[in-house]
């Protein structure tokens, strides 16, 4: 009899068997019948081992061994063994941020009887591999719960019968798609032509971000450093060298593994600052012994829309005015508290139209006509007085909470024209006649 038939090794097309027989008679001949669904064949050997060749991958073979000595046949013994499936090939991967759909091929005739074992391993984390086993004959699988923007390796073994696997797995590296930034916020930087962008890091891994800033024909593309989503930190970057009071289209794209996510977009407008001071000075002309006409051009709106103008008069030295003069009124002037005061206020919004950057409006103000604008009284001027005029332009005008109707110069965004040349008023004709 033959016993302890042992499959020493098996490949796709070969099988090495050895066995034992009860005595050491060397004259035994061992007759082998090799059967599979493809048919059967016979071979003989004097050895207690044989290598069977030319087998078909992934096929179940029944091998029956019968000993014979002097034409007397002993009891046969059998074993059943699959050859290994061929390795899978042509692995194809399609990904989204958290899943990968894998498909592959196996060209063995027996492949409809194979199942496949997939081992998915995140780069640098071999201890935590995911295993997926397909149903028989299925050559695709979707692996879920992956981490966005991360590198993975998949190994795919074909298997048949009781876990007889291909000698080598098919291997493929792939990356999941990076996650887009959910959103980002823009903050203006006070009195700076800049924007601060703030975001929380998207889930998963990233190598960095592409930042695109665009306004009209102007655009700028730059890279941003990578971030980590682990601790929910808020990340920020400052975009500088912009224009004031300008709308910008901003796009941020996550990058990882050479892949780019869908861009996240926002439209943001930069802040304002003091208007650029005009080159010229207002034009002042005498109208009567107690009034003048002040003509001036609107300030350039490149630092923000002009919200208001204040007409300032002085009888003093025409130094450069400061925001401090905005608190003085006609009443202060009459009391002698100041030789400079605000006589008239123009709120440009009241004109019911928006001024474009290039459009320069002309203003003509009658000073001394006893009108009142907010807290400022446009009182009569003094005959024989010498007056100069200056204009303050505001991109932001703030009023004192406690001094109703008076401008808070420190809190406002303001710049001043130069003072005009002085104009001297004539004598009151009533005095001459009298």
């Amino acid at each position: 009899a033959v016993f302890d038939i042992h499959v020493v090794y098996v490949t796709t097309t070969e099988m090495w068997l050895d066995w034992k027989s009860p005595d050491g008679a060397s004259e035994y001949v061992y007759h082998l019948v090799i059967e599979s669904k493809h048919g059967s064949n016979h071979t003989s050997t004097y050895d207690k081992a044989i290598t069977l060749q030319g087998l078909i991958p992934g096929t179940l073979y029944n091998i029956t061994i019968s000993p014979e000595v002097d034409h007397v046949w002993g009891d046969p013994n059998s074993t059943a063994q699959y050859t290994r499936p061929s390795n899978v090939s042509n692995i194809d991967v399609s990904t989204n941020t958290t899943a990968a759909t894998l498909s592959w091929q196996n060209f063995d005739d027996a492949s409809p009887t194979y199942s496949y074992c997939l081992l998915i391993e995140k780069a640098g984390n071999s201890s935590n591999a995911t295993q997926v086993v397909t149903d028989i004959g299925i050559t695709d699988a979707t692996v879920t719960e992956l981490i966005p923007g991360s590198s993975y390796t998949v190994e795919i073994f074909a298997q048949v019968g009781d876990g007889i696997k291909s000698l080598e797995p098919g291997r493929k590296s792939f990356c999941t798609d990076p996650a887009s930034m959910a959103s980002f916020d823009c903050e203006v930087v006070p009195k700076e032509p800049a924007l601060v962008l703030k975001w929380t890091c998207p889930p998963g891994a990233n190598a960095g971000f592409e930042l695109e800033v665009s306004s009209g024909a102007w655009n700028n593309a730059t890279h941003l450093e990578s971030c980590s989503s682990e601790n929910g930190t808020e990340y920020r970057t400052e975009v500088t060298y912009l224009n004031f009071s300008t709308s910008y289209n901003i796009s941020i794209t996550t990058v990882s593994c050479g892949k780019m996510a869908a861009p996240t977009r926002n439209t943001c407008t930069t802040g304002i600052t003091d208007p650029p001071p005009p080159d010229g000075s207002p034009n002042i002309t005498s109208v009567s012994h107690n009034s003048v006409k002040v003509k001036f051009s609107g300030f350039e709106a490149s630092h923000g829309p002009i919200k208001a103008y204040a007409v300032i008069l002085t009888t003093g030295e025409a130094g450069h005015p400061s925001a401090d003069v905005l608190k003085y009124t006609y009443e202060d002037f009459k009391k002698g508290a100041s030789d400079t005061y605000v006589t008239y206020l123009i709120r440009t919004e009241e004109k019911g139209r928006s001024q474009s950057l290039s459009e320069v409006l002309k203003y003509e103000i009658d000073v001394g006509n006893e009108s009142t604008t907010l807290g400022y009284y446009n009182g009569k001027l003094e005959p024989l007085g010498s007056y100069r005029a200056c204009v303050a332009g505001f991109t932001n005008i703030t009023f004192h909470p406690q001094n109703k109707g008076l401008i808070d110069g420190a809190e406002s965004y303001v710049s001043f024209s130069r003072y005009s040349d002085a104009v001297s008023l004539p004598q009151d004709p009533g005095v001459i006649c009298g």
Epitope: A207, E212, H223, S251, K259, A262, P263
Partner: antibody, heavy 117, light 107 residues
Framework: EVKLVESGGGLVQPGGSLKLSCAAS????????MAWVRQAPTKGLEWVAY????????YYRDSVKGRFTISRDNAKSTLYLQMDSLRSEDTATYYC??????????WGQGTLVTVSS | DIQMTQTPHSLSASLGETVSIECLAS??????LAWYQQKPGKSPQLLIS???PLHDGVPSRFSGSGSGTQFSLKIRNMQPEDEGVYYC?????????FGAGTKLELK
């Protein structure tokens, strides 16, 4: 699998025009910054033009500015390079490429442009 | 423009040898440095981006290092398929610029 296939190259006289195309597949074309890179015969590599994904902003090397125009059709997953006023020094193999974070990651097989009289 | 100076211009190495190619940027480029391999008649292939991460499918015998202005590409255990021209490239600032290339041959 990312695939980029350039076409439209050929022989053109100095001063002439040519339009190159790059058909993209296997990835979401509209997400990607794209570029053209060229290589003169037996010479090194030279970046030519670049287009962003968000607003389609374009950038060019100085020597082609005003003569070349890069554009994209996201619906057709195609990148273009319109080349006008061609010069002999524009003779090269032109490659299209994806460009995340300033690296030319995936390349096409290239298309040869020869400018000669 | 940022100049990328690559050294050496060419080199030959024996099978199994380790080789190094250097790249010097004329100004700081952070880590926006990529390495490419080009074989005759073929398109360039990205090996390394961001100074050191290997691109998908690139053998681990390739490695990159450096930041700022000085970078290097190291190839350990030289193989016949490593023959070709190697280029460095900065992606920090327009115009993106390449080194002149290093031709690597098998001895």
């Amino acid at each position: 699998e990312v695939k980029l296939v350039e076409s439209g190259g050929g022989l053109v006289q100095p001063g002439g025009s040519l339009k190159l195309s790059c058909a993209a597949s296997g990835f979401t074309f509209s997400n990607y910054y794209m570029a053209w890179v060229r290589q003169a015969p037996t010479k090194g590599l030279e970046w030519v033009a670049y287009i962003t994904n968000g607003f389609g902003s374009t950038y060019y090397r100085d020597s082609v500015k005003g003569r070349f125009t890069i554009s994209r059709d996201n619906a057709k997953s195609t990148l273009y390079l319109q080349m006008d006023s061609l010069r002999s020094e524009d003779t090269a193999t032109y490659y299209c490429s994806t460009v995340p974070l300033g690296a030319f990651v995936s390349w096409g097989q290239g298309t040869l442009v020869t400018v000669s009289s | 423009d940022i100049q990328m100076t690559q050294t050496p211009h060419s080199l030959s190495a024996s099978l199994g040898e380790t080789v190094s190619i250097e790249c010097l940027a004329s100004e700081g480029i952070s880590n926006y440095l990529a390495w490419y391999q080009q074989k005759p008649g073929k398109s360039p292939q990205l090996l390394i981006s961001h100074a050191n991460p290997l691109h998908d499918g690139v053998p681990s015998r390739f490695s990159g290092s450096g930041s700022g202005t000085q970078f290097s590409l190291k190839i350990r255990n030289m193989q016949p398929e490593d023959e070709g021209v190697y280029y460095c490239q900065q992606g920090y600032k327009f115009p993106y610029t390449f080194g002149a290339g290093t031709k690597l041959e098998l001895k």
